[in-house]
Interface confidence: low
């Protein structure tokens, strides 16, 4: 094996076509040098992935009750920088870097309870705005998915996580505007809301509506309202969800994790930091032999597809041995 | 053999301050999440706070945010809990514990928050 | 809610199998780990991320966490297993918040 030195703060493998790791991957409870050599005569328990249960472990080379992956590395187990195209938020959801969070339509008519209900169950909560650009960022999305767009032309209003609270009924109606969940303090409220059409007499709450006006030519206006509505009555809504970690495949992962982020190579491995891949290493593939012209698979860490006109369509670039 | 070696508990009054340390050795401390537990007389554990590796991150149980801050000096191996406006319910053994899950815990210092 | 419940006590003779259980919410999402502490002393790690054991630990612990549930069970319990043990995992509600269930006094009848 050819001499070669690790960088400050990386871990030589004694063995194996792995040559250097991070150095807190030593001792960490998972081998991931091919001879186990980090695991070896370490004095302590090593670290457990911190709790979550979603995710592929990748320096395992095994999913969670899965089949080995084809996770096969050559040389140094490189660190990259990532950019912005990896993903932070699941398929269908808007990501905003200003809150780093994701938000979603749900075009489904609920009422405000159980559209609360169902944003909780994704993770999330109905949406509060902590800044004008936030709420602008918001307006801007085309929301629409192609198939449901009349549903969303018809029913242009959000439930989002405020209340109206009424305080007097004297010559009108007096309140003020709360945030319906407990969350984030830096919110801002809302101004004087438009009030629906009919409302009860008993209602001492009701709930937030804003409304989008998504015709293209007033789109770039902002333009849009807020309504207090009788928060049994039946809307599509928007949920609001801090930024995560995602993966190829589109699986949400948990802090601490290793995962291969969504973006355009599947030979990144990372850890998952508040919702950002950290300290992430991409392996090195051997080209495959005995083909000139080869495609990578755009899923599949150094699996090729071979575009000679009589070569083999599907090469792995390792060799047998080194599995 | 990790060794999380505590000082710092005492009797205090109510409103006062006090600060807890935990001194790490046998493991690459710098690598590691570390949290602080506490367990009321007869009571049983909870969850206090937790600060990551590098000491950017911190979290609070809801019952302390704002009175105690976490912290660390990786250069020592030592974790810290300031405990700040004290109130006759923080009285409790406090435990230091390394890492999420934690694996290896302090001994435990009592801290008595009496007038 | 973002709670784990325990049973506060459980008894089992000398060389049987207990299983002690923790439910949970956010134990659907997240791995669960197993203290046990005994009288004065600081709490003790027998399981993480559901089953595994850390070394030192005797192959008599075992995990596991099904749906809203996780179990510790002791197979051939032996005297010095009397203590309470306690659940913990993250909560759902507070991703780095962390979450311990009331415990579970286990009592070892000769």
């Known amino acids: 094996r050819p001499e070669l030195r690790c960088n400050p703060g990386q871990f030589a493998c004694h063995g194996g076509t792995i040559q250097c790791i991070p150095l807190p991957w030593q001792c960490d409870g998972w081998p991931t040098c091919e001879d186990k050599s980090d695991e070896a005569d370490c004095p302590v328990t090593g670290e457990a992935r911190p709790y979550g249960k979603e995710t592929v472990d990748l320096r395992q080379g095994r999913a969670r009750g899965g089949d080995p992956t084809h996770f096969h590395t050559v040389n140094v187990a490189q660190p990259v920088r990532f950019s912005s195209f990896l993903g932070k938020c699941p398929s269908g959801w808007h990501h905003y870097e200003g809150t780093a969070s994701c938000y979603r339509v749900y075009l489904s008519g609920e009422n405000y309870w159980d559209a609360a209900q169902t944003c909780q169950r994704v993770n999330g909560s109905l949406a509060t705005f902590s800044t004008d650009q936030e709420l602008r960022f918001v307006l801007a999305q085309e929301w629409d998915q192609p198939e449901r767009s009349f549903g969303w032309k018809d029913q242009r209003k959000l439930w989002v996580g405020y209340q109206y609270v009424i305080t007097g009924r004297n010559h009108s109606l007096e309140g003020r505007w709360e945030v319906a969940f407990k969350g984030s303090p830096e919110v801002f409220l809302p101004p004087d809301p438009i009030f629906a059409s009919a409302m009860s007499e008993n209602d001492n709450v009701f709930c937030a509506q804003l409304q989008c006006f998504h015709f293209p030519t007033l789109r770039h206006h902002d333009l849009h309202s807020w309504h207090a509505e009788s928060c049994s009555e039946k809307s599509s809504f928007l949920c609001k969800r801090s930024q995560t970690c995602v993966d190829i495949k589109d699986n949400v992962v948990d802090e601490g994790f290793y995962f291969t982020p969504k973006g355009d190579d599947p030979c990144l491995s990372c850890t998952c930091h508040r919702g950002e891949p950290e300290m992430c290493v991409a392996a090195l593939c051997e080209r495959p032999q005995g083909c000139q012209q080869y495609r990578k698979d755009p899923k599949e860490c150094c699996k090729f597809m071979c575009l000679d006109p009589d070569g083999s369509s599907l090469f792995d670039s390792m060799a047998s041995g080194m599995r | 053999e990790v060794q999380l070696q505590q000082s710092g508990g005492g009797l205090v009054q109510p409103g006062g301050s006090l600060r807890l340390s935990c001194a790490a050795s046998e493991f690459p401390f710098s690598s590691y999440a570390m949290s602080w537990v506490r367990q009321a007389p007869g009571k049983g554990l909870a969850w206090v706070s937790a600060i990551s590796s590098s000491g950017g991150d911190t979290y609070y149980a809801d019952s302390v945010k704002g009175r105690f801050t976490i912290s660390r000096d990786n250069s020592k191996n030592t974790l810290y809990l300031q405990m700040n406006s004290l109130r006759a319910e923080d009285t409790a053994v406090y435990y230091c514990?390394?890492?999420?899950?934690?694996?290896?815990w302090g001994q435990g210092t009592l801290v008595t928050v009496s007038s | 809610s973002s709670e784990l419940t325990q049973d506060p006590a459980v008894s089992v003779a000398l060389g049987q199998t207990v299983m002690i259980t923790c439910q949970g919410h956010?134990?659907?999402?997240?791995?669960a780990s197993w203290y046990q502490q005994k009288p004065g002393q600081a709490p003790l790690l027998v399981i993480y991320g559901d089953n595994r054991r850390p070394s030192g630990i005797p192959d008599r612990f075992s995990g596991s966490n099904s749906g809203n549930t996780a179990s510790l069970t002791i197979t051939g319990t032996q005297a010095e297993d009397e203590a309470d043990y306690y659940c913990n995992s993250r909560d759902s509600s507070g991703h780095h918040n962390v979450l311990f269930g009331g415990g579970t006094k286990l009592t070892v009848l000769s």
């Open positions: 956010s134990l659907r999402s997240y791995y």
């Open positions: 514990a390394k890492n999420w899950n934690l694996d290896y």
